[in-house]
């Protein structure tokens, strides 16, 4: 959890989703005219996001408490979860409408379908997460969150297919962290780096969070991490809550979320 954009929330809220991202001027919030907002997006190879694109991003977790220009001179911002200081207690796109005065100063919402993205909120029964650009080396200064939320009663079986991150003794530079919860605070399982494949992990509940961070220097090959659903009736979910059994790590039951 952390204080950001005027509200207290956890890292489920994505910084970028479905090609949509938020930009502000170097001088800070609400400094861009419509023409400047357009320029910001275009200089990065994108364009101002449409209302539909912003809403599509919001639906998969894009949440920013700052009004910004969209295509056609519209202004608004995406709210996933209402908060007292943001969005008037509503969810959805808080829409200020099409502005007649294009010299008003707001932030910008850009859309770039080619932007390298990572992370998201996932409810599929199985999926493979890859470091950005895999199988090519990942870039410096990456931060990605993958939040898995399955049906109540289901569990998550995580396995590492490829793994090659910069190695340092404390995994302080580049690392993957796994949390047996829906945020990056509770249920810490472990931090991983180097090129040894970590053992499989099975969650205690129906949610899990993976965080990938790379620093500003050395990069490496990256990773592929697969998850599959373990249904309540399946044999592996009945295993004892021991720290490790074979090549699987079972976590003592703590976190479950509807």
């Amino acid at each position: 959890w952390g204080f950001k954009n005027g509200i207290f929330h956890n890292s489920i809220w994505l910084e970028q989703a479905a090609g949509v991202y938020h930009r502000e001027a170097r001088a800070g919030r609400y400094k861009l005219t419509y023409a400047e907002a357009k320029a910001v997006c275009e200089f990065e190879g994108g364009r101002l996001a449409t209302y539909k694109q912003l809403e599509a991003a919001r639906k998969i977790g894009f949440h920013v408490c700052a009004a910004g220009w969209m295509a056609k001179g519209r202004v608004g911002y995406p709210i996933v979860k209402p908060g007292p200081n943001c969005g008037f207690g509503k969810t959805g796109i808080i829409d200020y409408g099409i502005r007649l005065n294009r010299s008003e100063r707001w932030d910008a919402y850009c859309y770039n379908p080619h932007a390298k993205e990572c992370g998201g909120v996932f409810t599929d029964p199985k999926r493979i997460f890859k470091s950005p650009g895999f199988p090519n080396e990942y870039d410096d200064n990456q931060v990605c969150y993958w939040h898995i939320r399955l049906k109540y009663g289901q569990r998550i079986h995580l396995s590492f297919l490829d793994f090659d991150l910069e190695h340092d003794p404390g995994c302080l530079a580049d690392y993957v962290e796994i949390y047996d919860s829906y945020d990056d605070v509770h249920g810490f399982v472990g931090r991983y780096c180097g090129d040894e494949l970590p053992e499989d992990i099975i969650s205690t509940g129906n949610v899990m969070t993976l965080k990938f961070l790379s620093d500003a220097s050395v990069t490496a090959g990256g990773f592929q991490i697969k998850y599959v659903t373990v249904d309540p009736a399946s044999k592996s979910s009945q295993a004892k809550n021991t720290s490790t059994t074979g090549n699987k790590k079972f976590l003592p039951g703590r976190f479950s979320h509807l």
């Epitope: 930009r23 001027a25 170097r26 001088a27 400094k31 861009l32 005219t33 023409a35 400047e36 320029a39 910001v40 275009e42 200089f43 990065e44 190879g45 080619h114 932007a115 390298k116 870039d139 410096d140 200064n141 500003a216 220097s217």
Partner: antibody
Framework: QVRLQQSGAELAKPGASVKLSCKAS????????MHWVKQRPGQGLEWIGY????????KNKQNFKDKATLTADKSSSTAYMQLSNLTYEDSAVYSC?????????????WGQGTTLTVSS | ENVLTQSPAIMSASPGEKVTMTCSAS?????MHWYQQKSSTSPKLWIY???KLASGVPGRFSGSGSGNSYSLTISSMEAEDVATYYC?????????FGSGTKLEIK
């Protein structure tokens, strides 16, 4: 400290191509954008275009679209500009300069410049 | 293209004299930046975001302006200030420089 080291002077014939380099050190190459600027003798400065090394995205000024090709090699922290189909008007000093990608843009560090002479 | 017109093209000032040069933009911009270039060297960032002095720039320099009109001022001219000064806008495509003001000493 930040340093942008450019390749040495070039002498080329009309119609030929040259590839100028700009090696960055003292900072994280992929965290900044690299721009190229042209200056003809006794004249002002003209922006050519830029590359975002992290993504490879480039944007050139319209009149340099067919003239300048910008590339970057992340492994060696080097930006390149290839100038093709050279004419006498391409004789100039070409400088690389970095910006931090925050808007509005400015160049905080410059290379020392590469002198290109086009002569038959 | 946003054309930046600098005036005067050439000026000279005595040591200790106040110097002001201007930059006029054909389209309004929120910020202007300034570069100093001495002969046979690369330009140096001198003033950014209209009024912020780059690292190592003496306090006698200042920048101001808004919209279409910006200026660079030296409160008290010194010999080391002899150079050409270029204004620059990084707000719109294509990025553009002014034609420069050459500052000489009397």
């Amino acid at each position: 400290q930040v340093r942008l080291q450019q390749s040495g002077a070039e002498l080329a014939k009309p119609g030929a191509s040259v590839k100028l380099s700009c090696k960055a050190s003292g900072y994280t190459f992929t965290s900044y954008w690299m721009h190229w600027v042209k200056q003809r003798p006794g004249q002002g400065l003209e922006w050519i275009g830029y590359i975002i090394p992290s993504s490879g995205y480039t944007k050139n000024k319209q009149n340099f679209k067919d003239k300048a090709t910008l590339t970057a090699d992340k492994s060696s922290s080097t930006a390149y500009m290839q100038l093709s189909n050279l004419t006498y008007e391409d004789s100039a000093v070409y400088s690389c300069a970095r910006s931090d990608g925050s808007y509005p843009y400015y160049f905080d560090y410059w290379g020392q410049g590469t002198t290109l002479t086009v002569s038959s | 293209e946003n054309v930046l017109t600098q005036s005067p093209a050439i000026m000279s000032a005595s040591p200790g004299e106040k110097v002001t040069m201007t930059c006029s933009a054909s389209s309004s911009v929120s910020y202007m930046h300034w570069y100093q270039q001495k002969s046979s060297t690369s330009p140096k960032l001198w003033i950014y975001d209209t009024s912020k002095l780059a690292s190592g720039v003496p306090g006698r320099f200042s920048g101001s302006g808004s919209g279409n009109s910006y200026s660079l001022t030296i409160s008290s001219m010194e010999a080391e200030d002899v150079a050409t000064y270029y204004c620059f806008q990084g707000s719109g495509y294509p990025l553009t420089f002014g034609s420069g003001t050459k500052l000489e000493i009397k």
